[in-house]
């Protein structure tokens, strides 16, 4: 039960006090008791419950005609059952007794009021009056947890605007209101109560730039909402009529959890006594609601796809046809960024990552815009953000970034359990160097901090700086599977490729050609690839790098070898010993449910079929997956990327609610 104020009573004159329903009010009957009195009794109106405890051990007794010793060990507390119809209509009488004196009486006139700040602390999507039974001042995780949730109002419901909804202090319409969380102030007081009392709604100064609160006028249009708290306003005096009254507030978060903001925002209502104009207002009562800002959540390849994004660039019509066919098979919407908008930047995966935010009453896709800021710089903000599609970005917007800040270097695993710890939303994966050096690359700290601060998908740092481009999607992917953990981890594997090529040579196919059918590309015989000592050494190094990540992933995702599939792939070391795919990198695939868009490797054709394609199909088709090999050679591969790099996917949010987990 909420804590009320301390009321001191004195026999000299009647005391007038306010008691808020649902609070426990301490009664100090000792400090002003007549000197020669040794005991007391209490009588109260029917609407008041008095508890007297004398301890230790505590002997609790509700008020009656009994007398109690007048000593500091006696605790008297009051609660009120009903709100008062008029000021001071509930009475408590304390009688003091002494051995030689007649009883001395002290009178307390109580006004019972109902003041309750309510939000959806039970996470049902509805605001239910709590009557202060639950402690709204704490926010707890897990299925039995409690605490309200706020969304960052980061979409753009007004198509005429270029800004996010949370960047203005207006409510556009009911669509805009739906992105906010409802908070209700319920009051029940005597009619004249607010002539001597005031309610103030407030937020800590340290949190005022993270939240905005609008007050709604009941029964009026949403355009009648007016901002009462926010970056410029930490407090607001409320004009509340006496009697029974409900006041609605709509709350939007302005910032995601981050390194300097744990994501918790407390809104407090304070009841002030303003009866004495000569004295400052005194706090009578406070009620608070704590909200947690919903984290930005990534979706893994195992989540059903809803929309595919790709770029139209010079001469990639065939690539787009293949992606279109795949999207249709997977029943996905397809969005193509035209040439005039992408400015010859085809790397859709690198520009953005589409996740979502969720509150019990609303789920919103949110695009995380990387700071790479090349030709596609405007695409997330101009074409993706919109009504019910949010936007967030982090990191320096001009310079100071590396290739590891592109979001081909940002992936998320499917849900996993690791040594008994559950990650029901998976774990974020991003690439890094294995140790810091003068020229090593890492994901910008601002991005790392943001990802960690979301709390619900604890990030894992992998080693990717050995790659020329340096992205984790160059050596790993996840595909759905009907058995085991519900997925397989795919890893690029030079060892598996050499094994395959050796088998083909042993069967007499050493003359078969890699890159056959590619104009202007020097073809390579299996036997020459196998005999090239330098290439072997390069791939031995690559294998060690991938094996390091393999062990890291097994440990951090709780995987067994049987959860991993090796995809045959060769690499070559380029300048500064950075690796690039030797032929189109098959692990860099587009996963749309059971439909996979895999870079066509142009491997040696044996018995009319590419042996690399055949091998990959034999590994993935038993899982119910359908492999489509897409020719991306001249449009993507030779430009240091593949199918995954050139596409992006919006996926269905998890059915699991993030607040039900325990980070």
């Amino acid at each position: 039960m909420a804590q009320g104020t301390l009321i001191r009573v004195t026999p000299e004159q009647p005391t007038h006090a306010v008691c808020v329903l649902g609070t426990l009010t301490q009664l100090d009957i000792c400090s002003s008791a007549p000197e020669d009195c040794t005991s007391f009794s209490i009588n109260a109106s029917p609407g008041v419950v008095v508890d007297i405890a004398h301890g230790p051990p505590a002997k609790k007794k509700s008020t009656g005609s009994s007398t109690w010793p007048l000593d500091p060990g006696v605790e008297v507390t009051l609660t009120m059952k009903v709100a008062s119809g008029s000021t001071g209509d509930q009475k408590v009488q304390i009688s003091y007794y002494g051995p030689k004196t007649p009883p001395v009486k002290a009178l307390l006139y109580l006004t019972g009021v109902e003041i309750s700040l309510c939000a959806d602390i039970t996470r049902t999507g509805k605001v239910k009056p709590t009557r202060a039974v639950k402690d709204q001042r704490t926010w707890t995780w897990g299925p039995c947890g409690q605490g309200a949730i706020l969304l960052v109002n980061c979409d753009r419901d007004n198509l005429e605007s270029s800004a996010m909804d949370c960047e203005d202090d207006e409510v556009l319409d009911s669509e805009d209101l739906q992105d906010m969380s409802l908070m209700t102030l319920s009051t029940k007081t005597p009619k004249d109560f607010f002539t001597n009392h005031t309610l103030v709604l407030h937020v800590a100064r340290s949190e005022m730039d993270k939240v905005r609160v609008f007050q709604a006028t009941r029964g009026k249009l949403s355009s009648k909402c007016s901002v009462v708290l926010g970056p410029k306003w930490p407090s607001h005096y409320l004009m509340v009529p006496g009697g029974k009254h409900n006041m609605d507030f709509y709350v939007e978060a302005l910032a995601f959890p981050d390194t300097d903001f744990p994501g918790l925002i407390t809104l407090t209502i304070s009841l002030l006594d303003t009866s004495n104009l000569e004295l400052p207002e005194a706090v009578v009562f406070q009620d608070s609601v704590v909200f947690r800002v919903a984290p930005w959540i990534m979706t893994p390849n195992t989540q059903p796809p809803q929309e595919v994004y790709a770029c139209s660039i010079f001469e990639n019509e065939d690539f787009l046809k293949s992606v279109t066919t795949l999207a249709m098979k997977a029943k996905c919407k397809l969005t193509i960024c035209p040439e005039e908008e992408n400015m010859d930047d085809q790397w859709m995966q690198d520009e953005m990552e589409i996740g979502y935010i969720q509150a019990p009453h609303k789920t919103l896709p949110v695009v995380f815009d990387s700071p790479r800021n090349r030709g596609l710089k405007e695409f997330p903000i101009k074409r993706v953000m919109g009504p019910d599609f949010g936007y967030v970005t982090r990191g320096p917007q001009t310079g100071g970034i590396s290739g590891l800040d592109s979001f081909g270097n940002l992936e998320v695993s499917p849900p996993v359990t690791v040594r008994g710890k559950e990650y029901p939303l998976g774990r974020i994966l991003f690439g890094d160097s294995c140790y810091p050096s003068n020229d090593s690359r890492q994901m910008h700290q601002a991005l790392q901090d943001f990802l960690s601060a979301q709390q619900v998908q604890a990030p894992v740092k992998l080693y990717s700086d050995w790659l020329s481009v340096g992205h984790v999607d160059e050596f790993l992917s996840f595909v759905p599977a009907p058995d085991r953990k519900g997925f397989r981890l795919l890893l690029a594997s030079p060892r598996s490729c050499y094994k395959l090529f050796q088998e083909q040579q042993n069967e007499g196919h050493g003359e078969a050609l890699l890159f056959e059918g590619i104009k202007k590309k020097k073809q390579q015989k299996i036997k020459n690839i196998l005999s090239n000592k330098t290439l072997r050494e390069h791939n031995s190094f690559v294998e060690r790098c991938i094996d390091w990540n393999r062990e890291l992933l097994k440990r951090e995702l709780g995987l067994a070898e049987s959860d991993i599939i090796d995809i045959p792939q060769l690499f070559k070391l380029k300048e500064f010993s950075k690796a690039e795919a030797f032929f189109p990198n098959m692990v860099n695939m587009l996963v749309l449910g059971k439909h996979l868009g895999i870079p066509k490797p142009f491997g040696p054709v044996i018995n009319g079929r590419c042996c690399l394609e055949e091998k990959v199909c034999s590994l993935l088709e038993p899982l119910g997956l359908q492999c489509t090999f897409i020719n991306d050679f001249f449009t993507y591969h030779i430009r240091h990327g593949e199918v995954h790099c050139g596409t992006n996917v919006r996926r269905k949010p998890f059915s699991f609610k993030w607040w039900n987990m325990v980070p």
Partner: antibody
Framework: QVQLVESGGGLVKPGGSLRLSCAAS????????VSWIRQAPGKGLEWVSF????????YYADSVRGRFTISRDNAKNSVYLQMNSLRAEDTAVYYC?????????????????????WGRGTLVTVSS | QSALTQPRSVSGSPGQSVTISCTGT?????????VSWYQQHPGKAPKLIIY???ERPSGVPDRFSGSKSGNTASLTISGLQAEDEADYYC???????????FGGGTKLTVL
Amino acid sequence: QVQLVESGGGLVKPGGSLRLSCAASGSTLSDYFVSWIRQAPGKGLEWVSFINSANTFTYYADSVRGRFTISRDNAKNSVYLQMNSLRAEDTAVYYCSSANDDVDDIVAPGRGYYMDVWGRGTLVTVSS
Amino acid sequence: QSALTQPRSVSGSPGQSVTISCTGTSGDVGRYNHVSWYQQHPGKAPKLIIYNVYERPSGVPDRFSGSKSGNTASLTISGLQAEDEADYYCSSHSRSSTPVLFGGGTKLTVL
């Protein structure tokens, strides 16, 4: 074959900044590794910085690391060298040089370590 | 003080051969086959004449040849001609924190 032209040099006070540009013509610069090399008056060549063709990694000489930033805009067919906190010892002719990354060998040779196309250079003078 | 050591000057008569040495360490010349040589005439930009120790770009006469032994690389110019008079610089990839090193340069005089 690509041709390179440097610009942006000039006189600057110690502690000041300059941005050098290297514009390419005759070919697409996105196929090329690019390095900046400088030569102080009457002195030898000093390698300064490198950026790979994919625009995914960069390297710097110890003498300029933390003060200079190399970048590229393949759409503009240009590479840049942003020079901050300039010192008197940065006075030199700055050359932009490149090597083609369009290699068809099984194992690519070390084209990032040599420079087969050079610009004419732009003079940077750091003096108070 | 340059990281790779070259003689300050060499000279030879037309038709003769000259060799310019470039000495590094086991962390650069000795470790990598990424040694290159450049020719620079006064007031001009350098020109690549040898890469990957001994390979010649197209258009460079076969009078220019490169080699390497241990931590020392060499440039040999046979059949010296007057237009060969220039400064010559060697360069190598290095595992040090500055990944490309140059020699101090050698002035070739054709007598």
